[in-house]
């Protein structure tokens, strides 16, 4: 008779990241007997849901079930059937849904109700859908990258395989950029966190961490662009907006109703004498940069130091992992290398933005024009946010590591969220010494 392989003693977990621009499903796997060890959970699958973020379904909620089907069916295939019922599924919605909730609590609940009903029909252990706070988003992103970098273990097991020259057990700060919000999270050095709203205390694996975090709602790359357009159209002399953040020769028609749909543009709302306006790209990095800086109010700070809009920010400390759209945009622009200085990044951005739109379209024929057209803005916005918003300098720029994945797992809040909800990060160091990584991979 044929020998039957013993079933793997592993567990699985699913987290759906319901972002402002799209939803992604992540499947995690870990050895069942090592739940409390550091660094044992890893991502086995990412499935990007086709379509926009869930907040866009507010007028067509009956389509949500179909929207989620492909990725949920993928999860059914990846996870052994015998483990479906014990696999938890969590859905966390971020700033896109925070904005919808600001407009209407009922509309947000309507979307989440249908999301929950749809997900509960799958054979997994569905644990609900919720809008996570900006503070949670920042904190879980910080936990994810430090967990994956081995920063919480007594003796880092990743030292030989993590491609970052890091200062031993000092944690990395986390910089997360989404479509509708951006988060900055790090452990400041011997600095009191002057604003209680920005202070988090964790005890992880026997060590205390005093963490600073802030989420800037409306300062994700997509909402920042809407803000900039709303600000600039206020002072336009007619319905043609010459925009330095788009390539020369680029043209696009924008509906004023779309511009004012989001709560993020309310402060710039003005009765305009037209229903549409036309963007004409001029491709000028410096002017684009200056226009973006007008979104950051730096004239008021009730603390010793602020980022912008009167939000406390302690002096930057240590290395930072910049992920999500920070990574995707910089990767597209080929600017993620550790060797590229801030000056070089600025120089490359100037060249990129100045390239004619027709030339850009030819060079990147496989990229959707909607996305392609916005890289000049997004790249300039990232520089503006990091340098003027968060006060990175040419020197401290070298401490920013643009990270997509760490050991095959995406950097982002989802892993930290799952580790927390499944109680897999103990407050105290487990008694047994974790095996070396090679023992169980």
């Amino acid at each position: 008779t044929q020998n039957k392989a013993l079933p793997e003693n592993v567990k699985y977990g699913i987290v759906l990241d319901a972002g402002s621009s799209h939803t992604s499903l992540y499947i995690y796997k870990w050895p069942a007997e090592k739940e409390n060890d550091t660094g044992v959970v890893h991502q086995v699958e990412e499935c990007r849901v086709k379509g926009p973020g869930i907040s866009k379904f507010v007028q067509k909620v009956n389509e949500i079930g179909i929207y989620l089907t492909d990725c949920m069916e993928r999860a059914r295939e990846v996870i052994p059937r015998s483990q479906h019922q014990e696999t938890p599924v969590y859905l966390g919605a971020t700033a896109g849904m925070r904005l919808l909730r600001m407009e209407s609590e009922e509309l947000a609940d309507r979307v989440l109700d249908v999301v929950e009903r749809s997900l509960s029909n799958y054979p997994f252990d569905f644990q609900g859908a919720r809008i996570i706070t900006g503070q949670e988003e920042g904190a879980y992103g910080w936990i994810t990258i430090n967990y994956l970098l081995g920063k919480f273990s007594q003796k880092t097991r990743w030292f030989s395989i993590v491609p970052y020259e890091t200062n031993n057990q000092e944690t990395f700060g986390a910089l997360d950029l989404g479509g509708a919000s951006t988060q900055v999270t790090f452990v400041p050095q011997n600095q009191t966190i002057e604003s209680p709203d920005n202070a988090l205390q964790f005890r992880l694996y026997g060590k205390d961490y005093n963490v600073y975090t802030h989420s800037f709602l409306c300062y994700g790359k997509d909402q920042a662009l809407w803000q900039k357009l709303a600000k600039d159209i206020q002072v336009a002399s007619n319905e043609i907006l010459r925009d330095p953040c788009f390539h020369p020769g680029y043209k696009k028609v924008v509906n004023v109703s779309d511009l004012y749909k989001t709560p993020c543009t309310k402060r710039f709302e003005k009765k305009l004498p037209f229903d549409q306006f036309r963007i004409q790209g001029t491709g000028d990095y410096e002017q684009c940069h200056q226009s973006i800086l007008e979104l950051f109010n730096t004239s008021y700070c009730p603390y010793s130091q602020c980022a912008f809009n009167g939000i406390f920010l302690p002096p930057l400390q240590g290395d930072f992992g910049a992920f999500s759209a920070f990574y995707f945009v910089m990767k597209f622009l080929n600017l993620t290398s550790e060797k590229v200085s801030q000056e070089k990044v600025t120089e490359m951005m100037k060249k990129f933005c100045a390239q004619p739109w027709e030339e850009i379209k030819t060079s990147y024929a496989g990229v959707k024009e909607k996305y392609l057209s916005e890289y000049c803005f997004s790249g300039t916005y990232i520089l503006s946010l990091l340098l003027q918003g968060y006060h990175f300098t040419a020197d401290s720029w070298e401490h920013i590591h643009f990270i997509g994945k760490i050991q095959g797992s995406d950097a982002g809040w989802t892993l930290g969220y799952m580790l927390n909800l499944t109680n897999m990060i103990p407050a105290e160091q487990p008694l047994s010494t974790p095996l070396s990584h090679s023992t169980y991979v």
Partner: antibody
């Protein structure tokens, strides 16, 4: 004041199907979920599934997946529960109940009078 | 799924006395908990929702308390019409789940 009126008692053969109706009157039908709950003789309450008539979206307890279908007709303010491949263990009183708290609030505030379904050969 | 456990299964109380019924959830349900009363041959009736809010028309002698995993229904002074079966139900997550019930009978 919302009222739910269910169809009459049914006697069915094993292997057949039953379809129970639940007509709402005196309030908004579409926006609130309608749940179906059954109770076997001398037993407790068991949730089977739910639908939001406004969207036609139904969800079901894993135990009944593939065997139960819940639908709603907004024009007549009526919800339906069809259970197929009946067996003797399905003998129970079937209740419809309105989820009276709005979206994401699934407390069951208004109940139908119940429909006795007997499965016997 | 969330398992709801009620205790005791049967509670014998004299009219006018206080009755305390317990309900435990296998994981936190916050305050998403309801209590129902069911009399023989009748449909259940909602008494309490949100763990502690009385449904309309429910007498003040019925009160609910608790949050997370431990909940209590208290009937301060039992009337003859209160002898019935009481069920708790969580509505935080699908599937909606009920406790096994507590039968309150005349002592």
């Amino acid at each position: 004041q919302v009222q739910l009126v269910q169809s009459g008692a049914e006697v069915k053969k094993p292997g057949s199907s039953v379809k129970v109706s639940c007509k709402a009157s005196g309030g908004t039908f579409s926006k609130y979920g309608i749940s179906w709950v059954r109770q076997a003789p001398g037993q407790g309450l068991e949730w089977m599934g739910s639908i939001i008539p406004e969207f036609g979206i139904a969800n079901y307890a894993q135990k009944f997946q593939g065997r139960v279908t819940i639908t709603a007709d907004e024009s007549t303010s009526t919800a339906y529960m069809e259970l197929s491949s009946l067996r003797s263990e399905d003998t129970a009183v079937y209740y419809c109940a309105r989820e009276s708290g709005g979206y994401r609030d699934h407390r069951l505030g208004v109940w139908g009078q119940g429909t006795m379904v007997t499965v016997s050969s | 799924e969330i398992v709801m456990t009620q205790s005791p299964a049967t509670l014998s109380v004299s009219p006018g006395e206080r009755a305390t019924l317990s309900c435990r959830a296998s994981q936190s349900v916050g305050s998403n908990l309801a209590w129902y009363q069911q009399k023989p041959g009748q449909a259940p009736r909602l008494l309490i929702y949100g763990a502690s809010t009385r449904a309309s028309g429910i007498p003040a002698r019925f009160s609910g308390s608790g949050s997370g995993t431990e909940f209590t229904l208290t009937i301060s002074s039992l009337q003859s019409e209160d002898f019935a079966v009481y069920y708790c139900q969580q509505y935080l997550l699908w599937p909606l789940t009920f406790g096994g019930g507590t039968k309150v009978e005349i002592k």
